[in-house]
């Protein structure tokens, strides 16, 4: 029986470890600045890194600019978006800016898109200063189903800071759905 | 066999509880305002509380102004930094401020420092208002190895809000590395 | 013995699943805009949704405008608060605003209230622009005991953005207390 108990313990350790890892999808995606759209209107950002520098993904999928959920669960979602302008980049079309981020969820089964989180600020970036910067952070806890897709929309994408420490979003699974 | 099963169950409960607690390091460090450097340039903040008020730490180490990782894993890192100025504090050398935070990771093995997250804003804190305030929040999910160190750099440290609810950073382990 | 082992495994799976779910309370509460107080002073926000749209709660209680902890543990708490003003809403009493959020913890046993996190900004919302917007995000890791209550205070509540993606707060349990 002792050998049996050791076997039970051993198989349990394996099962616990394996199930724990399988049960915790995550992603941290950083902006791919080689393909940022221009303009000042709200656009969906489709170019993100998932496997270089701080960017990583596990048990989730990145496809067509969207983060796809592979496993039902409750996830903590977050985004950090930085905007900047230096006078050497040229004159702004307007000094009154609306710098915004929208974290959206799309369901393929029911083709609809809904905003989970939004943040940002109106800013007056006057010519009196040669450099302007502003960052937004949002985060929240959401129920996500397999197949649902998370995407990021921003206003004024041409002002995005292209550094991996500046503009990124991510998710990690916290618990199963009952 | 029933007694044996109870023993298996009992030992498993202990093991599960013990391993769960051991597997979840965390820290929430609050600013120690008795030792904030002056100056407007970017500086590393080295004085933080780890064991008073909201500040706490478990299975991580705080040493020489840095939060040291003791256990490999994926962690959620966060920081909240508040800046404030009241006219009674004196005259600002410039009304045009760059209020920034940088969350950095240092590896001792390869002596190098990298910024994981940054946030902030340029601000115009004019003399027309007697009081100014601004807060930054950043957060993200990162792979950390034992021995790596997390530190906080800010610009204009003399403007930091010294309250424990205002200026703090932290981390908690979410999952093991596969 | 094989049948016995299967029974051990089976009961363990059930126990593991059950204890895991029981051990992870969470809440994501979104603003109920039908009952937002007026005024510019700091007020406690008592009207939140807990069961519609993105709002949800499990193993925690929402009562009298407060999020009540039912289970000791370490929790990650967060809040996202959006303020906005359009000129069609009328003139602001002052263009110099202090837009703030305070996440507070109240203990019933010791009737006292303490601020866990704060964030915000002073803003100059001039009449030169027809629309103004600003969002605050705060988050942190805190030890909470059963019976303790979390509430949200803001300044200028009449400027709150009533969307569920804009103004919300939440919590999820990360680990037990040792």
């Amino acid at each position: 029986i002792r050998a049996e108990k050791a076997m039970v313990d051993g198989s349990w350790l394996d099962l616990a470890k394996r199930s724990k890892l399988e049960a915790q999808p995550f992603a941290h995606l950083t902006i791919n600045a080689t393909d940022i759209p221009s303009g000042s209107h709200k656009v969906s950002l489709s170019s993100w890194y998932h496997d270089r520098g701080w960017a990583k993904i596990s048990n989730m999928t990145f496809s067509n600019g969207k983060l796809i959920v592979n496993q039902d669960g409750f996830y903590y979602l977050y985004a950090n978006i930085c905007f900047r302008h230096h006078e050497t980049s040229g004159d702004l079309a307007t000094e009154y800016l609306q710098l915004m981020v929208y974290v959206t969820k799309t369901s393929i089964k029911i083709p609809s898109s809904h905003t989970l989180m939004k943040g940002g600020s109106t800013k007056y970036w006057s010519g009196n200063s040669e450099f302007h910067f502003y960052s937004i952070n949002v985060g929240g806890f959401f129920k996500l189903r397999s197949g649902e897709e998370i995407s990021i929309e921003v206003s004024n994408p041409s002002l995005l800071d292209p550094d991996q420490d500046a503009t990124y979003f991510g998710a990690f699974k916290v618990r199963d759905i009952d | 066999i029933r007694a044996e099963k109870a023993m298996v169950d009992g030992s498993w409960l202990d093991l599960a509880k013990r391993s769960k607690l051991e597997a979840q390091p965390f820290a929430h460090l609050t600013i120690n305002a008795t030792d904030i450097p002056s100056g407007s340039h970017k500086v590393s903040l080295s004085s933080w509380y780890h064991d008073r008020g909201w500040a706490k730490i478990s299975n991580m180490t705080f040493s020489n102004g840095k939060l040291i990782v003791n256990q490999d894993g994926f962690y959620y890192l966060y920081a909240n930094i508040c800046f404030r100025h009241h006219e009674t504090s004196g005259d600002l050398a410039t009304e045009y401020l760059q209020l920034m935070v940088y969350v950095t990771k240092t590896s001792i093995k390869i002596p190098s420092s990298h910024t994981l997250m940054k946030g902030g804003s340029t601000k115009y804190w004019s003399g027309n208002s007697e009081f100014h305030f601004y807060s930054i929040n950043v957060g993200g999910f990162f792979k950390l190895r034992s021995g790596e160190e997390i530190s906080i750099e800010v610009s204009n440290p003399s403007l930091l809000d010294p309250d424990q609810d205002a200026t703090y950073f932290g981390a908690f382990k979410v999952r093991d590395i596969d | 013995i094989r049948a016995e082992k299967a029974m051990v495994d089976g009961s363990w799976l059930d126990l593991a699943k059950r204890s895991k779910l029981e051990a992870q309370p969470f809440a994501h509460l979104t603003i109920n805009a039908t009952d937002i107080p007026s005024g510019s002073h700091k007020v406690s926000l008592s009207s939140w949704y807990h069961d519609r749209g993105w709002a949800k709660i499990s193993n925690m209680t929402f009562s009298n405008g407060k999020l009540i902890v039912n289970q000791d543990g370490f929790y990650y708490l967060y809040a996202n608060i959006c303020f906005r003003h359009h000129e069609t809403s009328g003139d602001l009493a002052t263009e110099y605003l202090q837009l703030m959020v305070y996440v507070t913890k109240t203990s019933i046993k010791i009737p006292s209230s303490h601020t866990l996190m704060k964030g915000g900004s002073t803003k100059y919302w001039s009449g030169n622009s027809e629309f103004h917007f600003y969002s605050i995000n705060v988050g942190g890791f805190f030890k909470l005991r059963s019976g303790e209550e979390i509430s949200i205070e803001v300044s200028n509540p009449s400027l709150l953005d009533p969307d569920q993606d804009a103004t919300y707060f939440g919590a999820f349990k990360v680990r037990d207390i040792d």
């Epitope: - | 600002l92 050398a93 440290p157 403007l159 | -």
Partner: nanobody, 127 residues
Framework: EVQLVESGGGLVQPGGSLRLSCAAS????????MGWFRQAPGKGREFVGF????????YYGESVKGRFTISRDNAQNPVYLQMNSLRPEDTAVYYC????????????????????WGQGTLVTVSS
């Protein structure tokens, strides 16, 4: 890397005028508070003047008060030092620096409170 470049120096007769400028390159600090200092041969660095980031406040060394004026463009770069009624004792190499403090302290006239010094520009007052 930040670099400050002073220019506008030269030879001028006593009673004459010169306008120096200080421009920043690299990661610029054009909206920082700035200071002008000078160093005559064989002497230490002497405080000339200070200007806040907005240009709203200026301070001057005793020896130049009423003769020298610091200004800055409303836009940004550079910071100017207008020198009038020049005297032979104004002969020196003139340097600008970026004030390193957030608040104006009583030590604004000390060169140790400044960073990112340039190479300087020589001003010679002689007949």
């Amino acid at each position: 890397e930040v670099q400050l470049v002073e220019s506008g120096g030269g030879l001028v007769q006593p009673g004459g005028s010169l306008r120096l400028s200080c421009a920043a390159s690299g990661r610029t600090f054009s909206r920082s508070a700035m200071g002008w200092f000078r160093q005559a041969p064989g002497k230490g660095r002497e405080f000339v003047g200070f200007i806040t980031g907005s240009g709203g406040t200026t301070y001057y060394g005793e020896s130049v008060k009423g003769r020298f004026t610091i200004s800055r463009d409303n836009a940004q770069n550079p910071v100017y030092l207008q020198m009038n009624s020049l005297r032979p004792e104004d002969t020196a190499v003139y340097y600008c620096g970026v004030y390193r403090r957030t608040y104006i302290s009583s030590t604004y006239s000390e060169s140790s409170e400044y960073d990112y010094w340039g190479q300087g520009t020589l001003v010679t007052v002689s007949s």
